[in-house]
Interface confidence: low
C-alpha cells in the first residue's frame, strides 16, 4: 500500500492522543534506554510502511503484536486516514477478528514495540523552524 | 552495508557534456531525497543540486541552473546528472549525497558516495 | 542569497576545546547541520539539527544554535580530529542547500 495520500495530520492526532499512550503501557516496567532504534523511516509515507510492517507482519519471536490495543487503534486510524487502505487489508482483518488477551510479552516483542515507538517519534517530528 | 557509487567523472573540453550516475545499495532509496554537491580543487564544499524522493520536485544552485538536470530512476535505484554546456568552473569533485526528505529539505547530509572527479579543459 | 561565514582556520592545542563558528542572519532561526572532512575523503556528518550527533560520532562533538551564531564545540580534542569542518543550512526563501566557506581545524 502507498501510504502517500494519507492524512498526516489527523494521524499524527490518533497517535498523540492514544496510540501512544497503549505503546507506553504496553512497555512498562522497560527502560527507556533498554534498546537501541535499527529502524528508522526518512518521510511520513515511509514511516508509515515500516510502522504497518512492525505492527502487523509477524516476525520471528513475536507474532502477537497485530492483536494489541495500540496496533487495533493503528489499523483503524489507517483505514480512516489512508484512502483505500482498508480494502488491501482484508485478509489481515480475519486474523484480528481472533483477538485474545496476551499471554506472555516476550523481550522480542518488546524490543520491537520499542522500535515502533521511535518510528512514530519520526513520524511526528515536529516541524523544527520552517519559515 | 548502505552506499553510493559515483561514477561518469571525466576530463571535458569546454561547452561539452557530460552525465554523472550514481548507484545506491543497502536503503530504501525511493524514500530518500537525494543531492549533487561539488568541491574544486582546494576548495569548500559547494551544493549543486537536489531531487525529491519521488522526482517530484528539483532544486538547483544558480550556478548551474539551465545547464545542469538532476533525475532518479526509483526502479533502479540509480541518480543521475546531466551537465551541458560545461566551464572550466565547473571542474570538480561531485559526489552524490543522501538526505532524509521530510516537509522541505532542511535535513542534513547522512550518507554520502567518494565522489567522482570532473575536469573541463580545453 | 544567504551566506554562512565561517573562520577559515582555527588551532588548539590537544586535550582542550575547540569552538568553530558559522554566522549566518538569524541562523537560529534554521537548523544548522556540520560536517567534518579529512583530506582526500567524502565529508562525514557529526552534528546535525543545530545539536544531535549520529550514533557513531563520540560525544565531544556538540553543537549550539541561536541568534546570528551557531557554533560546533570539539572538547578534549584529539590529533584526530585535525580536519576541514563545513556548516550547512536550507535556505527556504531560495530553496537552496548552503554551505559556510569551511574551517580547519589545526591540533598542535
Known amino acids: 500500500y502507498d501510504f502517500t495520500n494519507c492524512d498526516f495530520e489527523k494521524i499524527k492526532a490518533a497517535y498523540l492522543s492514544t496510540i501512544s499512550k497503549d505503546l507506553i503501557t504496553y512497555m512498562s516496567g522497560t527502560k527507556s534506554t533498554e534498546f537501541n532504534n535499527t529502524v528508522s523511516c526518512s518521510n511520513r509515507p515511509h514511516c508509515l510502511t515500516e510502522i504497518q510492517s512492525l505492527t502487523f507482519n509477524p516476525t520471528a519471536g513475536c507474532a502477537s503484536l497485530a492483536k494489541e490495543m495500540f496496533a487495533m487503534k493503528t489499523k483503524a486510524a489507517l483505514a480512516i486516514w489512508c484512502p483505500g487502505y482498508s480494502e488491501t487489508q482484508i485478509n489481515a482483518t480475519q486474523a484480528m477478528k481472533k483477538r485474545r488477551k496476551r499471554k506472555v510479552t516476550t523481550n522480542k516483542c518488546l524490543e520491537q514495540v520499542s522500535q515502533l515507538q521511535g518510528l512514530w517519534r519520526r513520524f511526528n517530528r515536529p516541524l523544527l523552524k520552517q519559515q | 552495508q548502505m552506499q553510493l557509487v559515483e561514477s561518469g567523472g571525466g576530463v571535458v573540453q569546454p561547452g561539452r557534456s557530460l552525465r554523472l550516475s550514481c548507484a545506491a545499495s543497502?536503503?530504501?532509496?525511493?524514500?530518500?531525497?537525494m543531492h549533487w554537491v561539488r568541491q574544486a580543487p582546494g576548495k569548500g564544499l559547494e551544493w549543486v543540486a537536489v531531487?525529491?524522493?519521488?522526482?517530484?520536485?528539483?532544486h538547483y544552485a544558480d550556478s548551474v541552473k539551465g545547464r545542469f538536470t538532476i533525475t532518479r530512476d526509483n526502479s533502479k535505484n540509480t541518480l543521475n546528472l546531466q551537465m551541458n554546456s560545461l566551464r572550466a568552473e565547473d571542474t570538480a569533485v561531485y559526489y552524490c549525497?543522501?538526505?532524509?526528505?521530510?516537509?522541505?529539505?532542511?535535513?542534513?547530509?547522512?550518507?554520502w558516495g567518494q565522489g567522482t572527479m570532473v575536469t573541463v579543459s580545453s | 542569497s544567504y551566506v554562512l561565514t565561517q573562520p577559515p582556520s582555527v588551532s588548539v592545542a590537544p586535550g582542550q576545546t575547540a569552538r568553530i563558528t558559522c554566522g549566518g542572519n538569524?541562523?537560529?532561526?534554521?537548523?544548522v547541520h556540520w560536517y567534518q572532512q579529512k583530506p582526500g575523503q567524502a565529508p562525514v556528518l557529526v552534528v546535525y539539527?543545530?545539536?544531535d550527533r549520529p550514533s557513531r560520532i563520540p560525544e565531544r562533538f556538540s553543537g549550539s544554535n541561536s541568534g546570528n551564531t551557531a557554533t560546533l564545540t570539539i572538547s578534549r580534542v584529539e590529533a584526530g580530529d585535525e580536519a576541514d569542518y563545513y556548516c550547512?543550512?536550507?535556505?527556504?526563501?531560495?530553496?537552496?542547500?548552503?554551505f559556510g566557506g569551511g574551517t580547519k581545524l589545526t591540533v598542535l
Open positions: 549525497v543522501r538526505a532524509p526528505q521530510w516537509y522541505l529539505s532542511a535535513e542534513a547530509f547522512d550518507l
Open positions: 543497502g536503503f530504501a532509496f525511493r524514500t530518500y531525497g
Open positions: 531531487i525529491w524522493y519521488d522526482g517530484s520536485n528539483t
Open positions: 538569524l541562523i537560529g532561526s534554521k537548523l
Open positions: 539539527d543545530d545539536s
Open positions: 550547512q543550512v536550507w535556505d527556504y526563501s531560495s530553496n537552496h542547500v548552503v
